[in-house]
Interface confidence: medium
């Protein structure tokens, strides 16, 4: 029985050219986290494996950094980075938990005027 829950940073916004940390946290379970996959839509960004370490997709290696913790840091953000991101926790013996984060990357001038994107 899967008892855990994933907490995420939720819906976030960031400035074009800046950086953002995508963070998920698995709680309420004693299951062992064996691997975390980070995906953007259907594209695999990174794998963090408990035994075998961090691996960043070559397509993103110049703009994605591992951590902090099991999170992921996106750098040099562009408007094209806007969209859904998923943290997929593989655990034993529970199975798979998935968290969702929506990121909107704002033009600098928009961000400076305090605009924030929200999903009702």
């Amino acid at each position: 029985m899967m008892t855990g829950t994933i907490e995420t940073t939720g819906n976030i916004s960031a400035e074009k050219g800046g950086s953002i940390i995508l963070q998920c946290h698995l709680s309420s379970t004693t299951a062992q986290v064996t691997q975390v996959n980070w995906e953007q839509q259907d594209q695999l960004l990174a794998i963090c494996n408990a035994d075998l370490g961090w691996h960043i997709s070559p397509s993103f290696k110049d703009r994605v950094a591992p951590g902090p913790g099991l999170g992921l840091t996106l750098q040099s953000l562009t408007v094209n980075d806007t969209g859904e991101y998923f943290c997929i926790y593989h655990t034993y013996p529970d199975g798979t938990y998935t968290g969702r984060i929506f990121l909107e990357v704002l033009e600098s001038s928009v961000a400076e005027h305090g605009a924030r994107f929200q999903i009702p």
Partner: nanobody, 115 residues
């Protein structure tokens, strides 16, 4: 469950080369990480090198520039090319593979570097 079988170990002189192979059979995943660990007598098991399904690689500082990890996805096989071997590389080398859940491990192959 994935079965992993290592081969290619043996006795080699300092400065020599060996190529280890790790063949995986059984349940496999499209998104995986595969790696080589080693354990010398009286020491803890350490990660030597790993490679992901999308081709990124990791190397321990002690083997950078000397060891090269690669994988042939069509054969479900990983390789560790070991050059400029040193006596301190002597250890049992284990292959591991994970598709997300518990990692699968091979039985190990002994590499001895000695003159």
């Amino acid at each position: 469950e994935v079965q992993l079988v290592e081969s290619g170990g043996g006795l080699v002189q300092p400065g020599g080369s060996l190529r280890l192979s790790c063949a995986a059979s059984g349940r496999t995943f499209s998104n995986y990480v595969m790696g080589w660990f080693r354990q010398a007598p009286g020491k803890e098991r350490e990660l030597v090198a790993s490679i992901s399904s999308f081709g990124s690689t990791y190397y321990a500082d002690s083997v950078k520039g000397r060891f090269t990890i690669s994988a042939d996805n069509s054969k479900n096989t990983a390789y560790l090319q070991m050059n400029s071997l040193k006596p301190e590389d002597t250890a049992v080398y284990y292959c591991a593979r994970s598709g997300g859940f518990l990692s699968d491990w091979g039985q190990g192959t002994l590499v001895t570097v000695s003159s």
